[in-house]
């Protein structure tokens, strides 16, 4: 485990206040834990429970964050893992607010150049393998939130300290208010609403829905892009096929993309990534004599 | 106990490419950046860069991108140091090293170096 | 990138006297400053973090202090196991960089 890590400040969960809200009952059903004379029940929820070694790792991933982003020395570890601890912890975890995740925003304030935001939608890894590459350019998951809490799952349980490694809440089948959607909702709408200049988007050309409404990307990013900041969003539409030669940026949902964004005074581009594979070569080596032609 | 042990010495031929190991134990692998750091014979500390096992991004200082490339396995604990196009000013001691939270920002940790002489 | 210059290059001294040396960064590294000690063929142990904090186990005869620009890196009462080259790191902008080193040498 993280012993060194911990030699000098131990995670603490009796400290700080905890909120707690009205317990409205969920889809879950209550499963008996504990041993002892007197049962205690936990809800079983649909969805798998708190990633193993939760608390541990969102410590350490702030401080693998803080290392290598000198510009962020300021933040304390200990009191973003206290802050994202108090968010959900003794919380009904169906029952979670963007309020409870302010105090966490609030340490976690962190701004991206004008002209350099990568949005994305369900082509999460080519957007990141892109940013490590054209490393002045920042998906949600390139700042310290998005870093910390990435492909990570985590709840708690209406008035017990305890976090619940054996279930939390599915978005469908039990709540939308849950711990990790209602993070991402957070602070998806932070970073939205923080970009300026020409906002970058990367969407899956291989869905039968390139442009979603019902992702992140459609329901949250794109409602909290500010006109004012922001002047153009430009799409990128990544194929998967090698024979691939259609036109995306002429598909229905790119075309109702472009309606909703230029119905918010924001002007629309939208371009085709034939070779994602050979997009990424021309990012690495843009000298590259195959990287005069298309891409 | 941390420990960082890396791989013995290497003798490359000049262009050929060596790759060195450093195998970490006493923390789990993910949850710390592994540096690595150059030392030339009778000469100072020059830092390569880092890797992030968790992830596999990396960050290697200008001077050493065209020759240095990191790379780590989470399922060994080990991190990788791989030199390309080897010339006789790459030899020199390649050392792996972390920080430890609390401690600022320095490195505590370190592993014993592994010597890699170019020659022909 | 951040230059360290660090002086002198070397000092020849005796055992229980006062030794001083310095690290000039090329521009403000607010207190990222560490002090590492090198003996001869092995790796470097790191002695100061953060300007002037004793890392752990580190006797208390060596010292750092200094911020911004200017660094110092005292062993107050020198013993013969102190013999070695020390090094200042800045870690405050990537690329982290070292000074070139003062090699303490036996009068």
């Known amino acids: 485990g993280l012993n060194d890590i911990f030699e000098a400040q131990k995670i603490e969960w009796h400290e700080g206040s905890h909120h707690h809200h009205h317990h409205h009952h969920g889809s879950g059903s209550l499963v008996p834990r504990g041993s002892g004379s007197l049962p205690r029940w936990r809800q079983q929820w649909s969805g798998s429970g708190t990633t193993s070694r939760f608390p541990e790792t969102v410590l350490a991933r702030c401080v693998k964050y803080t290392e290598v982003h000198p510009e962020m020395r300021h933040v304390d570890c200990q009191s973003v893992w206290d802050a994202f601890k108090g968010a959900f912890i003794s919380k009904y975890p169906c029952n979670i607010t963007e309020e409870d995740y302010q105090p966490l925003v609030k340490l976690g304030t962190q701004t991206v150049p004008c002209n350099k935001t990568l949005l994305w939608s369900r082509i999460k890894d080519l957007a990141h393998q892109f940013t490590q590459v054209q490393r002045d350019m920042f998906t949600l998951e390139d700042m310290l939130l998005g870093y910390l809490a990435d492909d990570l799952t985590w709840c708690g349980e209406f008035n017990t300290f305890e976090i619940n490694y054996q279930s939390c809440p599915d978005w469908r089948k039990d709540c939308s208010n849950n711990p990790v959607s209602v993070f991402w909702k957070t602070v998806s709408r932070r970073f939205a609403e923080t970009a300026c200049g020409v906002v970058h988007v990367m969407l899956n050309g291989s869905r039968s829905k390139i442009f979603d409404k019902n992702s992140t990307f459609g329901s949250v990013e794109v409602h909290n892009l500010q006109p004012e900041k922001v002047q153009a969003l430009e799409a990128w539409v990544i194929h998967g096929g090698r024979e691939d030669s259609r036109d995306l940026c002429q598909d229905p949902t790119i075309k109702e993309l472009e309606s909703i964004i230029s119905k918010r005074n924001i002007r629309f581009f939208c371009k085709n990534i034939y070779r994602p594979d050979k997009f990424l070569q021309c990012v690495k080596n843009p000298e590259d004599s195959s990287c005069l032609s298309g891409i | 106990e941390v420990q960082l042990q890396q791989s013995g010495p290497e003798v490359g031929r000049p262009g050929s490419s060596v790759k060195i190991s450093c195998k970490a134990s006493?923390?789990?692998?993910?949850?710390?950046?592994m540096n690595w750091v150059k030392q030339s014979p009778g000469q100072g500390l020059e830092w390569i860069g880092w890797?992030?096992?968790?992830?596999?991004?990396?960050d290697v200082a200008e001077k050493f991108k065209k020759k240095a490339t990191l790379t780590a396995d989470s399922s060994s604990s080990t991190a990788y140091i791989y030199l390309s196009g080897l010339t006789s000013e790459d030899t020199a001691t390649y050392f792996c090293?972390?920080?430890?939270?609390?401690?600022?920002?320095?490195?505590?940790?370190w592993g014993q170096g592994s010597l890699v002489t170019v020659s022909s | 990138d951040i230059v360290m210059t660090q002086s002198p290059t070397s000092i020849s001294i005796s055992v229980g006297e006062r030794v001083t040396m310095n690290c000039k960064a090329s521009?403000?590294?607010?207190?990222?400053v560490d002090w590492y000690q090198q003996k001869t063929g092995q790796s470097p142990k790191l002695l100061i973090y953060?300007?002037?904090n004793r890392y752990t186990g580190v006797p208390d005869r060596f010292t750092g202090s200094g911020s911004g620009t200017d660094f110092t890196f005292t062993i107050s009462n020198m013993q013969a196991e102190d013999l070695a080259v020390y090094y200042c790191?800045?870690?405050?902008?990537?690329?982290?960089?070292f000074g070139g080193g003062t090699k303490l040498e036996l009068k």
């Open positions: 790191m800045q870690s405050n902008t990537h690329p982290r960089t």
């Open positions: 521009q403000n590294v607010d207190s990222d």
């Open positions: 090293a972390r920080t430890k939270y609390n401690s600022g920002y320095g490195f505590p940790y």
């Open positions: 953060k300007a002037s």
């Open positions: 890797i992030d096992p968790e992830y596999g991004r990396t």
């Open positions: 006493g923390y789990t692998f993910t949850d710390s950046v």
